[in-house]
Interface confidence: low
């Protein structure tokens, strides 16, 4: 309705003399701030004067201040959303109505609050779930409809008079919806629980009392069960009478049936509260309980193991491990069915007693292969020996011993022979199943453990095998001393260490990585013909002449090699100029003559010049010099001068004519 | 009539040796475990060790243990107490008790009978 | 090792039940006997088992067992149930006996 304030807050509120109440309140005025409020204590409305009567516990002036007179309430509220009120100390007079008289600039309201406030502090209640089952927890809840921020109070737990040691979760509520304090107890009760007192005890601050309240605990259980056994040590030999006897100490709600288990398994026809057993045999030992039932289910008594004594049975072997790896260690446990248990053991090992063993276990802290075989044992009680049974095999496996790689060749070997290598061991267990090379190659196995390289290589040094079962044995590598030529055989320059110039002392070396065996023999060859057979090969004055391809050569017992060919390159300046004329050196006015400077150079000439017979040098720089048209003043005596990086070379002088032409004879 | 006879009680000085004996007369000796029980002058039992009828199992307290060796011989329907390295706290009255069972490991059942004790002095 | 645990000292008037206790893990897996020694004398095994009397024994004395503790009753004690009683039981290794409680008959 738009016509109404809206408040919300607690509908009662509950509290005792000399406490206190704390009122969480929010509103929303019809239209404005609040301007004024006023709290009455059961207001009435008065028609004659259009105003409430009634005590005023508390009055707002309009600029908010509070008369200094209204300490008990406080107003915690605001101008628009809040309306929270605090009464501290509460009386008992202060019970019924509060009015909250709200008025904006336009608008009045009066929302009114109930105030519960007793004499004494009421009690707190205790909530328990519909059904209490044992060993099912529950949560216990205690609920006290007070909180107030001005007085603390806690809630204890207590069973039978005393504090209960699980840890309770307390909580509380001040809120507009709800105002409560809580104490939860997760609890797992017991069947002795049943019919036990539960406070919940409400103390104030210092632990003084104040309330409390009290229920008695309904747990539903199973019945509980005493067995009491003749003879109570329910020991007896095959032939004795045993009686047991089943009384039910709790049982809520009452029991319905009865009956007797061996083993976990029910004994037919045994619906009664007593178990008579006649002339028992070995068969009936085992653990006895009786069962009583109720609605909620099975309670069982606890187990009393009747031991009916007979002499061991026949033996057996359990190893354990077979089969048993050399070197572990293997347990042999020797069974054998008997009451009482057997005193002492004699162990056999296939069929001879194992002397000094007479324990129900038989430990070997280090399996070597001759502990292999059968092994059988006997049990002995105070009633008897038994008989030895079949016994058990131990498998003792171990790697392949002895294991060594023969190579099957006749020595020396080549590079690119076929090598042949077998496996060998001496024993094994398990066999074995496969064999493993290193190095690992594309090599060929023909059969197992022989291993076959073809065109072995130079650089095959070593092998090793392995022979394995669960295993691998390896052997100590063999050398295979591999024979092969001399290898990367090149020319390297050792002097000059630059270029090498004409007239240089030059030595060449010829270097090879390896050789298999290591004497080997050098030769030096240029062009086909043979220069030399040491290692080095020199040139004390280098010339031209000394330039090519050289090769060298070496070779041992196995075979020879040669390098790539080496050129061998001698720089020299311009050598052997001369001045070649075309079309001759004798040419008709008019024509074209062309000049060539021919030379001999390494490196090429980079760079000519021209000199006429005066030594004039001309401004030209190429290898040709063309004269065109030629003319008469162009006779003459001719040079050329080469250059290149190393230095300079001259031609001699070459003489050109150039002679008249008929028509310029017939001009003259 | 069951009996049980100790002997062997004697002045010691601390680190030598010493050996009890139990004669047994009036039952089956080979049938039962045997038990050393001692009682220090104005103090409690103390069990010491224990024996299967047929040796096979054997028990120390810790107090004796690597120290004292219990034997028997149901031929002679005697039990022995081998006590070496004797210390002033092994002074006591040594029972030798006669156990209801036949392995000193069985189910507890009690020692049934108790000979008079011979007298353990252990100083220098 | 286990460790039963006895009062040192208890007292009942003549013609009134007394109950001697014994504590110890070891009671939760085997029963207690007990045993009455007068000065200068060998200890008497009077209970054994759960609740078992050997020959000789009155029928005053009785045992009972519940968790880790063992009980010892004299229903209408006589003055020559004056002495020394001790429990023991077996433990992991061996047996293992009580401190001892000494009765006194007022």
């Known amino acids: 309705d738009s016509s109404k304030w809206v408040f919300e807050h607690p509908e009662t509120l509950y509290a005792w003399e000399g406490a206190c109440v704390w009122i969480p309140c929010t509103y929303r005025a019809l239209d404005g701030d609040l301007e004024s409020f006023i709290l009455f204590h059961n207001p009435e409305y008065n028609k004659n004067t259009s105003k409430f009567d009634g005590t005023r516990l508390y009055e707002s002036t309009k600029d908010g201040k509070v008369p200094s007179e209204q300490k008990r309430v406080q107003f915690l509220g605001d101008k628009n959303k809040n309306c929270t009120l605090s009464i501290h100390p509460v009386h008992l007079n202060d019970s019924g109505q509060l009015g909250l008289r709200m008025e904006s600039k336009t608008e009045k309201w009066m929302e009114r609050i109930h105030l519960n406030v007793s004499e004494r502090p009421f009690p707190p209640h205790i909530q328990l779930p519909p059904e209490i089952q044992e060993s099912q927890e529950v949560t216990l809840t205690c609920l006290l409809n007070f909180s107030c921020y001005g007085y603390p109070i806690q809630l204890q737990w207590l069973l039978e008079g005393v504090p209960m040691r699980q840890a309770a979760v307390t909580s509380t509520s001040l809120t507009i919806k709800s105002v409560f304090t809580r104490s939860e107890l997760k609890f797992s009760p017991q069947w002795s629980h049943h019919g036990k007192i539960v406070t919940c005890q409400l103390q104030d601050a210092d632990g003084k009392f104040l309330s409390n309240d009290t229920v008695q605990l309904n747990v539903k259980h199973t019945p509980k069960l005493e067995i009491k056994v003749t003879p109570s040590d329910a020991i007896v030999r095959e032939g004795d009478s045993v009686t047991m006897t089943c009384e039910v100490s709790s049982s809520n709600p009452e029991y319905t049936t009865v009956s007797w288990l061996k083993d976990g398994t029910s004994l037919k026809k045994q619906n009664t509260f007593t178990l008579n057993l006649r002339e028992v045999t070995k068969d009936q030992s085992g653990k006895y309980c009786c069962q009583v039932s109720n609605d909620v289910g099975p309670g069982r008594s606890e187990e009393v193991f009747l031991q009916v004594q007979y002499a061991p049975e026949p033996s057996t072997v359990q190893i354990l491990h077979s089969p048993a790896v050399e070197g572990s260690q293997v347990e042999f446990l020797c069974m054998s069915l008997a009451n009482p248990l057997p005193t002492n053991y004699t162990w056999y090992h296939n069929g001879k007693e194992m002397q000094g063993r007479t324990e129900e276990k038989v430990h070997i802290p280090k399996i070597l292969p001759w502990h292999a075989g059968t092994y059988s044992c006997v049990a002995e009680n105070i009633l008897g020996t038994g008989q030895r049974g079949p016994g058990a095999e131990l498998d003792v496996q171990y790697p392949p011993k002895k294991v060594t790689t023969v190579i099957q060749n006749p020595m020396p070997i080549r590079e690119g022979d076929t090598v042949t290598l077998s496996c060998n061991y001496n024993s094994s267990n398990p066999s074995v199943t496969r064999y493993e090379w290193k190095p690992h190659g594309a090599w060929e196995e023909p059969s197992l453990g022989v291993l076959k390289i073809q065109n072995v290589g130079w650089d095959n040094t070593t092998i090793a095998c392995a022979a394995c079962n669960s295993w691998c044995s390896w052997a100590s590598p063999v050398a295979l001393n591999v024979q092969y030529a001399p290898r990367d055989v090149r020319v390297r320059k050792i002097k000059p260490l630059s270029e090498i110039h004409s007239g240089n002392s030059v030595s060449l070396q010829c270097d090879f990585s390896s050789s298999h065996p290591k004497e080997v023999q050098f030769f030096w060859e240029k062009n086909g013909r043979l220069l030399g057979k040491e290692s080095q090969l020199n040139f004390d004055s280098i010339s031209p002449e000394d330039a090519g391809s050289y090769s060298c050569w070496v070779n041992n017992s196995i075979g020879q090699t040669a390098s790539k060919a080496w050129t061998l390159e001698v720089l020299y300046a311009p050598r052997r100029l001369r001045v070649s004329m075309s079309p001759g050196d004798q040419v008709m006015e008019g024509k074209s003559a062309t000049l060539t400077c021919e030379s001999d150079a390494n490196p090429p000439v980079s760079h000519y010049t021209w000199f006429d017979w005066n030594n004039q040098s001309l401004p030209y720089h190429s290898q040709k010099l063309r004269l065109e048209p030629v003319k008469v003043q162009h006779s003459g005596a001719y040079w050329c001068q080469g250059t290149n990086s190393v230095g300079k070379g001259r031609s001699p002088l070459s003489t050109l004519t150039v002679y008249y032409s008929p028509e310029t004879i017939g001009r003259r | 009539e069951v009996q049980l006879v100790e002997s062997g009680g004697g002045l010691v000085q601390p680190g030598r040796s010493l050996r009890l004996s139990c004669a047994a007369s009036g039952f089956t000796f080979d049938d039962y475990a045997m038990h050393w029980v001692r009682q220090a002058p104005g103090k409690g039992l103390e069990w010491v060790s224990g024996i299967s009828w047929n040796s096979g199992s054997i028990g120390y307290a810790d107090s004796v243990k690597g120290r004292f060796t219990i034997s028997r011989d149901n031929a002679k329907n005697s039990l022995y107490l081998q006590m070496n390295s004797l210390r002033a706290e092994d002074t006591a009255l040594y029972y030798c008790?006669?156990?209801?069972?036949?392995?000193?490991?069985?189910?507890?059942?009690?020692?049934?009978?108790w000979g008079q004790g011979t007298l353990v002095t252990v100083s220098s | 090792s286990s460790e039963l645990t006895q009062d040192p000292a208890v007292s009942v008037a003549l013609g009134q039940t007394v109950r001697i206790t014994c504590q110890g893990d070891s009671l939760r897996s085997y029963y207690a006997s007990w045993y009455q020694q007068k000065p200068g004398q060998a200890p008497v095994l009077v209970i054994y088992g759960k609740n078992n009397r050997p020959s000789g024994i009155p029928d005053r004395f009785s045992g009972s067992s519940s968790g880790n503790t063992a009980s010892l009753t004299i229903t209408g004690a006589q003055a020559e149930d004056e002495a020394d009683y001790y429990c023991n039981s077996r433990d992991s290794s061996g047996w293992v006996f009580g401190g001892g409680t000494k009765l006194t008959v007022l």
């Open positions: 008790a006669k156990d209801k069972g036949g392995g000193y490991y069985d189910f507890w059942s009690g020692s049934d009978y």
